[in-house]
């Protein structure tokens, strides 16, 4: 009876999410294996959170509103083994849109999501940021190393959404 | 003083190139972004090129890309346009432009007076 | 590309009338409290002129006359007080993404 009100409230909740993801990925987690957590195929998982990996070629502005419709951001990057996972799928003569922006121009970053930029917790390319007309922040490929670079904004970029996984 | 001044317009046969230049002064010129924008006669503004400050940037729209060159050379604190295959809808006045960001974008905030380039046979 | 429409074409305006120029875009170049519309003015023979950057900053200069407002997609300029050295072109330009586009102009003219 316990597993069969559960299995309805998951199909419930996958109803639910149904008309804003058409299909979702799912594990099994927790201690018991009782706990799902989902991401829309065919995003990607890691840790707590998903990651789609958007080919189309958008200004920053855009890239961002393109993620929100989706229920994400641009991707914050926390920890480098989250930098280490999201590198696998990236092509190395490509540039990424991260969800990190200076939108003044006087070297106060920002991350989309309002989480603290912390200095200690960055991997710019060496000599990099280096201008302030270059606003917002992308991860490339460069010196044998995936590292981040400051850059115009309006010029057009594939991109990198992030959001939390769902739990079903 | 703010100034930018074009030069090298004229007039010029369909299939022919033409070199604009276009010399400033009164301000820091390797620090910003530059455009040229045209204007054909009678008509509105038309962006060409953007170059950004330290020229790792260039940017066309179809109508001009492969045809048209934009390029500076901070030492001498000028911009250039170097115009091949020129067809008869390139005949505009073509203005020289200083960008200013803002926020996520940039603004023109100084012009020239502008050089004519005339296609014709 | 994004489109930007103006309207209306012309405008005869009395002097010390008000004069409105809208502008639209063909989807929005507002992000958060950004809004990456501007304005400029040009005069018969003369290069075109900034007014107002960033929908609604009045560029340094500029009689206080003139006025910008709007976000997302549907943006204003208004001259409150119309002045015979106002007659001019006035275009609207967008700049949230490459390339930089402008809509086709209004002609301010005196009634």
């Known amino acids: 009876n316990f597993m069969y009100s559960k299995t309805v409230k998951r199909l419930s909740k996958l109803q639910e999410y149904q008309q804003y993801y058409p299909s979702l990925t799912c594990v099994m987690e927790g201690k018991d294996m009782e706990d799902w957590s989902c991401c829309p195929t065919p995003w990607t998982s890691f840790q707590s959170s998903c990651y789609f990996i958007s080919t189309v070629m958008q200004s920053w502005t855009k890239s961002q509103n393109n993620c929100s419709v989706m229920g994400a951001d641009l991707v914050v990057i926390n920890t480098k083994e989250e930098q280490d996972f999201i590198t696998q799928n990236l092509k190395i003569n490509s540039a990424y849109f991260l969800g990190l922006s200076d939108p003044k121009g006087w070297r106060h970053w920002q991350w989309v999501d309002q989480t603290p930029y912390n200095k200690n917790v960055t991997f710019w390319h060496s000599g990099e940021p280096n201008s302030p007309d270059e606003r917002c922040a992308i991860i490339n490929f460069r010196s044998e190393e995936w590292g981040w670079n400051d850059v115009h904004c309006h010029v057009p970029q594939k991109s990198i959404c992030k959001m939390k996984k769902i739990y079903i | 003083e703010v100034q930018l001044v074009e030069s090298g317009g004229g007039l010029v046969k369909p299939g022919g190139s033409l070199r604009l230049s276009c010399a400033a002064s009164g301000f820091t010129f390797s620090s910003y972004g530059m455009s040229w924008v045209r204007q054909a006669p009678g008509k509105g503004l038309e962006w060409v090129s953007t170059?950004?400050?330290?020229?790792?940037?260039?940017y066309y729209p179809d109508s001009v890309k492969g045809r048209f060159t934009i390029s500076r050379d901070n030492a001498k604190n000028s911009l250039y346009l170097q115009m091949n295959s020129l067809r008869a809808e390139d005949t505009a006045v073509y203005y020289c432009a200083r960008q200013i960001y803002y926020d996520y974008a940039y603004y023109f905030d100084f012009w020239g007076q502008g050089t004519t380039v005339t296609v014709s046979s | 590309d994004i489109v930007m429409t103006q309207s209306p074409d012309s405008l005869a305006v009395s002097l010390g009338e008000r004069a409105t120029i809208n502008c639209r875009a063909s989807?929005?170049?507002?992000?958060?409290?950004?809004?990456?519309m501007h304005w400029y003015q040009q005069k018969p023979g003369q290069p075109p002129k900034l007014l107002i950057y960033g929908a609604s900053n009045l560029e340094s200069g500029v009689p206080d006359r003139f006025s910008g407002s709007g976000s997302g997609t549907d943006f204003t300029l208004t001259i409150s007080s119309l002045q015979a050295e106002d007659v001019a072109v006035y275009y609207c330009q967008q700049s949230i993404e490459d390339p930089p586009t402008f809509g086709g102009g209004t002609k301010v003219e005196i009634k």
């Open positions: 989807e929005s170049v507002s992000f958060r409290t950004s809004h990456l």
């Open positions: 170059i950004s400050s330290g020229d790792s940037y260039t």
